[in-house]
């Protein structure tokens, strides 16, 4: 069978090979389409120019005034010329509809490097067959599930027209130190060949690079955190970031009920002050960042290192 592609809504003429160009003709068309139950026979005598359905023209061709999805199928003609020679024609008709230009909706104006971001949703309306949507970065195809690229797709069919609406949501994780203004576009590729792709207008979001966090430093005085009973320990939390973050203190993994401050003073150390201390810096743009932990211990006079179970001390430290 000869393959024919016809655009929905357009007229279609199928030639009946071997048929005399003018009446009278001995020919018969057989159709098996979405409009017919099994094979339907059409003769040259049926139908009129005023009809909006398939009919045989005076030259023996089959005419469909406006092709629809229901007209997909097989069309056969059997004709006999004036000398009695029989000729058969066989067509396989497929229909298509080019959608409107695809669009990117809900597009992001800014992306953050190093984390997944929704770039936008590409929408194509009114295609048949469905076709496909694909994304491009700086003109090159983006491959889903590679290098931080993910795509969520959805296909819907219009209940009356039978035409398709496609949606494709793009998520990317921009690399740190990459292009600060990448160009994204989306294109629709038709389900039937020989039709060029339709591309959206490009979008160019900015890529925002978060400043890498420098480590929060915890400085202990005296060094090593070992102190004689009744002595004083000063803990200083140093954060290079600007503006200065809020500093909270932890002991043995539990927050200390103290107002924020970069310095914690433990005067007149007693056994209850012994433990593991750390500070937590909270930035407005990032999450909390914890320092390394240091161990505070009491040493008896004459001892080289810390000893447990020492007595004395005043309890909770004070803030400078």
């Amino acid at each position: 069978a000869q393959n024919i592609t016809a655009r929905i809504g357009e007229p279609l003429v199928l030639k009946c090979k071997g048929a005399p160009k003018k009446p009278p003709q001995r020919l018969e068309w057989k159709l098996n389409t979405g409009r017919t139950e099994a094979w339907k026979v059409l003769s040259p005598q049926g139908g009129g120019p005023w009809d909006s359905v398939a009919r045989v023209l005076p030259n023996g061709s089959l005419f469909l005034p406006a092709v629809g999805i229901q007209d997909e199928g097989i069309f056969r003609c059997q004709a006999m010329n004036r000398n009695g020679k029989e000729t058969k024609s066989n067509y396989r008709v497929r229909v298509y509809q080019i959608p409107g230009k695809p669009e990117i909706v809900d597009s992001a104006s800014e992306l953050t490097a190093g984390v997944p971001n929704k770039v936008g949703t590409c929408v194509s309306e009114g295609s048949y067959p469905a076709g496909t949507l694909s994304w491009h970065l700086d003109g090159k195809p983006l491959v889903p599930n590679e290098k931080g690229v993910s795509v969520k797709e959805q296909t819907r069919r219009h209940p009356e027209t039978g035409l398709f609406t496609l949606q494709s949501e793009l998520m990317v994780t921009p690399a740190r130190g990459g292009d600060p203004r990448p160009t994204f576009s989306c294109s629709f590729s038709p389900g039937l060949p020989r039709h060029r792709a339709l591309r959206t207008a490009p979008i160019q979001p900015r890529v925002w690079e978060p400043v890498p966090l420098e480590e929060v430093q915890l400085v202990v005085e005296p060094e090593g955190g070992a102190v004689a009973p009744g002595g004083t320990v000063t803990l200083t939390c140093e954060v290079p970031a600007q503006p200065s973050p809020q500093i909270h203190w932890m002991k043995d993994g539990v927050p200390l009920p103290l107002p924020p401050s970069p310095v914690l003073i433990l005067p007149e150390i007693g056994p209850q002050d012994q433990g593991t201390y750390s500070c937590v810096a909270t930035h407005s743009s990032h999450g909390p960042q914890e320092s390394r932990a240091v161990s505070i211990s009491i040493i008896e006079p004459g001892e080289e290192g810390p000893t447990a179970g020492s007595v004395g001390g005043s309890g909770l430290g004070t803030l400078a």
Epitope: P23, S43, Q45, G46, P49, W50, L57
Partner: antibody
Framework: QVQLQQSGAELAKPGASVKMSCKAS????????MHWVKQRPGQGLYWIGY????????EYNQKFKDKATLTADKSSSTAYMQLSSLTSEDSAVYYC??????????WGQGTSVTVSS | DVVLTQTPLSLPVNIGDQASISCKST???????????LDWYLQKPGQSPQLLIY???DRFSGVPDRFSGSGSGTDFTLTISRVEAEDLGVYYC?????????FGSGTKLEIK
């Protein structure tokens, strides 16, 4: 050869109905649609409507929608037209004519209808 | 409705003369299928109409070649190259491009 033999002349009273026939021969009756045309004495031709004898589907000129009813009997290869609620305006010759898919090619000899009280 | 206007209403001719009848339509009769559905009929006195020309210019079987049709769109002409006595009667143009189908008002061909 193609022949369309129409029934004889009708004389009817105002308000009455008449049913005329058109017997086809020389071709396959169900393959061709049958049209009907009116011609008043000394006047032109007016299309009434057509019937597809294969399916019984009909299409009428709006001007004749309430006047004419077209039917067909496949077994006898005969098309019929009934005219109702006759008035003097319906006095005319009525032709059946075969539709070939692109033109009307053969006509019956006509049935004369006279409406008179 | 499509109105077909024929001119002249009456055409007196001599036998052997050429005769031309015009038919003008209020709408184009060119169908989306590429064909133009305009036909010509002759109704001889006391007879049924008979088909002469279909699809503007195609002669029906048995019609002498002195009859020819021409035109396109909305303007059409029937020409009889050499009129013979048997050609007398009323000529009608007819359109089947759209419903309702309509006929021209007729042109009477008569001897001078």
């Amino acid at each position: 050869q193609v022949q369309l033999q129409q029934s004889g002349a009708e004389l009817a009273k105002p308000g009455a109905s008449v049913k005329m026939s058109c017997k086809a021969s020389g071709y396959t009756f169900t393959t061709y649609w049958m049209h009907w045309v009116k011609q008043r004495p000394g006047q032109g031709l007016y299309w009434i409507g057509y019937i597809n004898p294969s399916t019984g589907y009909t299409e009428y000129n709006q001007k004749f929608k309430d006047k004419a009813t077209l039917t067909a009997d496949k077994s006898s290869s005969t098309a019929y037209m009934q005219l109702s609620s006759l008035t003097s305006e319906d006095s005319a010759v009525y032709y059946c004519a075969r539709w070939a898919g692109y033109t009307i090619d053969y006509w019956g000899q006509g049935t004369s209808v006279t409406v008179s009280s | 409705d499509v109105v077909l206007t024929q001119t002249p209403l009456s055409l007196p001719v001599n036998i052997g003369d050429q005769a031309s009848i015009s038919c003008k339509s209020t709408k184009s009769l060119l169908n989306s299928d590429g064909f133009t559905y305009l036909d010509w009929y002759l109704q001889k006195p006391g007879q049924s109409p008979q088909l002469l020309i279909y699809l503007v210019s195609d002669r029906f079987s048995g019609v002498p070649d002195r009859f020819s049709g021409s035109g396109s769109g909305t303007d059409f002409t029937l020409t009889i190259s050499r009129v013979e006595a048997e050609d007398l009667g009323v000529y009608y143009c007819f359109q089947s491009n759209s419903l309702p189908l309509t006929f021209g008002s007729g042109t009477k061909l008569e001897i001078k």
